[in-house]
């Protein structure tokens, strides 16, 4: 039988039964929040083999191995993670061994073992038989492996009875509890499976199978299943679902969901059955299976209840995420904010048509209306009082629309208005109406010049750039002396300067009233001799990055209700120069031959330029009388070299309280102080555990529906 | 956790109609896929009839196509099995199953069941 689509078993045991007749839970696993200890034993799921996404484990009290309850859970194929993870265990108390003893796969994913105060037989189970890579486990804050005293079956009798591999270079005996051995096939089957008794299983087996080489008797599948049978890929006509068997299209059309998408059913992409189209493709009419590609963003279209939708908060546009077409009004009223104006591009920059009007009154905070980086059509088919579709009132830090140079929008009906916008130059204004087609449609007071403006500097002369310098981390930039009418009018410069990996920045990005500025900015006094031209050195920048540059002069912005000129430059790239990059990352060598090296390494993370070869040193070193003092033919153990890992054993510390020099006569040493780097890992590794575990909080603890 | 109550269940003509109600209690309603099974005496459950989150998508089983209608009130938490031309063989106990974001065709582990009511179709 198969259940899902996932199962979480929480806050009463008895729910447990829900999995009585499950041999395949098409989903994840969760168990948690059971805060009354029971008693597990009368519960036991012996058919349970097989898990396509997770199974997590967190706050199940009384709960002290699952052996007992999953004794033939056999693969967890990590289809979907838990952030990152296929097995998550998380503050179980009484947990005394995981004891999956029949555990032989996990397909995807890591496991996260952590906060479970009595846990023990970790340190006996090899991962590396059961996930491809353990690099990314996480086992941590669980019972102290001094504590434990784990013990493999007949280890005790000295007529051990599991087999031994070497982790971190401790090689050992295999065990899941005291009493179950961790199975390992032969070396024969290699990456397959084996049966009870050791015969090889199918190639399409995954984890073990009931009768050798034979792909109907498998556990699981490797691939794929269908009628029966293990198969390297889905027959024609069959389509791949939940990452694990093969369904036709009429078991396709006939899911049912409960999720807001369901009106339209699953589809069939890609040769997969899936509940939607994936990004960048759209369903080829509203009742249809298949999906075609998207010319352009996919897209939206939401509606207002209400027929007009208010901008007044990051809230309210966040429900505009991803609409491309918006049908009804758009009233923006952003008085004040954090970052406002990248935050209202992140959920409004994909819309494209506005149905009704546009109404922008009242928001101090925005500097530009750029943030609505794709509109490019307002229908006017509801229009305000007096027919106006794009009404701009009393927005007191408004200087740009739109980058007119870069941007086609059309108002198809109606009349623009703009009143009280006193840092938005009328040429401005007028510019739009030349780009939107509205020219002629505005009567003489729907654009006011007297208030529009009023207290910018709108003829703008252009400051040209007299030199550029640069080096691997500093740029020095000067330009023409400005010289307005009158000179007392200039007061200083400003510079602004970013990163810009394209050639595409406008002067108004990220940028808002509220002190949010993707620009760096600095100041530049006039220099006191008027024959020097004004520069300035940029310093503390990354080696070969392009920047974006652009130089304001500061002037008086009215003189006796007169407008005056302002002047800034165009925006320059320029990229610093190259450097020597940092360090190659993770090398690694092995000895493939009683000749031959192989070295592998990862790229640096900063290279600060374009990285042509690498230099690659080698040399011959000693060979080390260690290895020659220790009978290897003798059965005691092999001694392990140890490392100082450059962390410190509390209770070691504690036993060794006296300072001692180290050398002469041999006595006990203080651990050395934690390097800046050690100290910066203990932070990120906080930081990531905190982060964990705001995210199980954040997916378990949901309101209670209404 | 849901709690699930069938009523509308009794004895009925064949040929005759009959509306079988389920009473959801609980969270999210709209949240879970319901259907109807059946199980007739000495015989093993059958599934009679699905229906989505949202009531616009409904799945039937052959025996019961063009007979039966399923339909949902999520306003009300309630949901419906409208059965026409009643015959002999549709002589069951009827449940009332629900399943949390999804059902496929070979779902029989609903993860909710109520306790069921006996629909008896004789002359």
């Known amino acids: 039988e198969i259940c899902g689509p996932g199962i979480d078993i929480r806050n009463d045991y008895q729910q447990l039964k829900r999995l009585e007749n499950c041999t395949v839970i098409e989903g994840y696993l969760h168990i948690l929040l059971i805060s009354k200890a029971e008693d597990y034993r009368s519960y036991r799921f012996p058919k349970l083999t097989v898990i396509t996404e997770y199974l997590l484990l967190f706050r199940v009290a009384g709960l002290e191995s699952l052996g007992d309850l999953f004794p033939n859970l056999t693969v967890i194929r990590g289809w979907k993670l838990f952030y990152n993870y296929a097995l998550v265990i998380f503050e179980m108390t009484n947990l005394k061994d995981i004891g999956l003893y029949n555990l032989r796969n996990i397909t995807r994913g890591a496991i996260r073992i952590e906060k479970n105060a009595d846990l023990c037989y970790l340190s006996t189970v090899d991962w590396s038989l059961i996930l491809d890579a353990v690099s990314n486990n996480y086992i941590v804050g669980n019972k102290p492996p001094k504590e434990c005293g784990d013990l493999c079956p007949g280890t005790m009798e000295e007529k051990p009875m599991c087999e031994k591999t070497t982790i971190n270079n401790e090689y050992n005996y295999r065990c899941w509890t005291t009493n179950r051995c961790q199975k390992m096939c032969p070396s024969t089957c290699g990456k397959r499976a084996c049966t009870e008794n050791n015969e090889c299983c199918h190639p399409e087996c995954l984890g073990s199978c009931s009768a050798p080489d034979n792909d109907t008797a498998c556990v699981a599948c490797r691939h794929y299943y269908y009628a029966g049978v293990c198969v390297p890929a889905c027959p024609p006509n069959t389509y791949r679902f939940e990452g694990w068997r093969c369904v036709d299209r009429d078991f396709c059309a006939n899911i049912l969901s409960a999720e807001s998408s369901d009106s339209e059913g699953f589809v069939i992409h890609d040769g997969e059955c899936m509940q939607e189209c994936p990004s960048g493709f759209i369903r080829n009419g509203s009742q249809s299976m298949y999906c075609i590609p998207c010319e352009g963003p996919c897209p939206k279209v939401c509606e207002e209840e209400k027929k007009t939708k208010t901008i007044d908060s990051v809230t309210s546009a966040q429900m505009l995420q991803g609409c491309t077409i918006f049908k009804g009004n758009l009233l923006i009223n952003i008085r004040r904010g954090n970052n406002i104006a990248s935050e209202l591009e992140n959920f409004m920059g994909l819309i494209e048509v506005v149905t009704g009007y546009v109404k922008i009154r009242h928001s101090h905070a925005l500097v530009s209306l750029s943030f609505l980086k794709n509109l490019r059509l307002i229908l006017g088919e509801e229009q305000l009082e007096g027919n106006y579709s794009f009404y701009v009132l009393d927005n007191q830090n408004l200087q740009q629309l739109w980058d007119w140079d870069h941007r086609n929008l059309t108002i198809k009906a109606g009349k623009m208005y703009f009143a009280f916008n006193p840092k938005l130059c009328v040429s401005e204004i007028y510019r739009m109406e030349e780009v939107t087609g509205t020219k002629g449609r505005q009567s003489k007071g729907d654009i006011n010049t007297r208030n529009n403006g009023e207290r910018a500097s709108c003829e703008s002369d252009v400051l040209h750039f007299t030199s550029t310098t640069t080096s691997k981390n500093r740029i020095i930039i000067t330009w023409h002396r400005y010289r307005p009418p009158d000179y007392r009018d200039l007061i200083s410069f400003t510079v602004y300067y970013k990163e810009a990996p394209f050639k595409n920045v406008t002067e108004y990005d990220g940028q808002d009233a509220c002190g949010s500025n993707s620009w760096n900015m600095v100041d530049v006094d006039l220099p006191p001799n008027k024959d020097v031209e004004p520069g300035i050195l940029l310093h503390g920048l990354k080696p070969w990055t392009q920047y974006a540059v652009y130089v304001k002069a500061v002037t008086l912005t009215m003189v006796e209700n007169d407008h005056i000129r302002g002047a800034k430059s165009e925006i320059l790239y320029i990229r610093t120069n190259a450097s020597v990059p940092s360090i190659p990352l993770d090398v690694l060598s092995a000895s493939n031959s009683s000749s031959q090296l192989i070295v592998k390494w990862n790229p640096p993370s900063l290279p600060n330029g374009n990285l042509s070869y690498y230099i690659v040193r080698w040399q011959r070193q000693p060979q080390d009388g260690y290895l020659y003092r220790h009978n290897y033919c003798s059965k005691d153990k092999i001694p392990i070299r140890k490392y100082a890992d450059g962390t410190i054993d509390i209770e070691e510390v504690t036993e060794n309280p006296k300072t001692e020099v180290c050398g002469g006569e041999k006595g006990p040493c203080c651990a050395c102080p934690k390097t800046e780097a050690e100290k910066q890992a203990e932070k990120e590794e906080a930081e990531y555990r905190k982060v964990f575990e705001n995210f199980l909080h954040n997916s378990i603890f949901v309101p209670r529906p209404e | 956790e849901v709690q699930l109550v069938e009523s509308g269940g009794g004895l009925v003509q064949p040929g005759g109609s009959l509306r079988l109600s389920c009473a959801a209690s609980?969270?999210?309603?709209?949240?879970?896929?319901m259907a109807w099974f059946r199980q007739a005496p000495g015989k093993g459950l059958e599934f009679v009839s699905a229906i989505s989150g949202s009531g616009s998508r409904a799945r039937y089983a052959d025996s019961v196509k063009g007979r039966f209608t399923i339909s949902r009130d999520n306003s009300k938490n309630t949901l419906y099995l409208q059965m026409n031309s009643l015959r002999a063989e549709d002589t069951a106990v009827y449940y009332c199953a629900a399943n949390p974001r999804r059902a496929t065709p070979d779902l029989t582990q609903y993860a909710y069941w109520g306790q069921g009511t006996l629909v008896t179709v004789s002359s």
């Open positions: 609980g969270p999210a309603f709209s949240s879970f896929v």
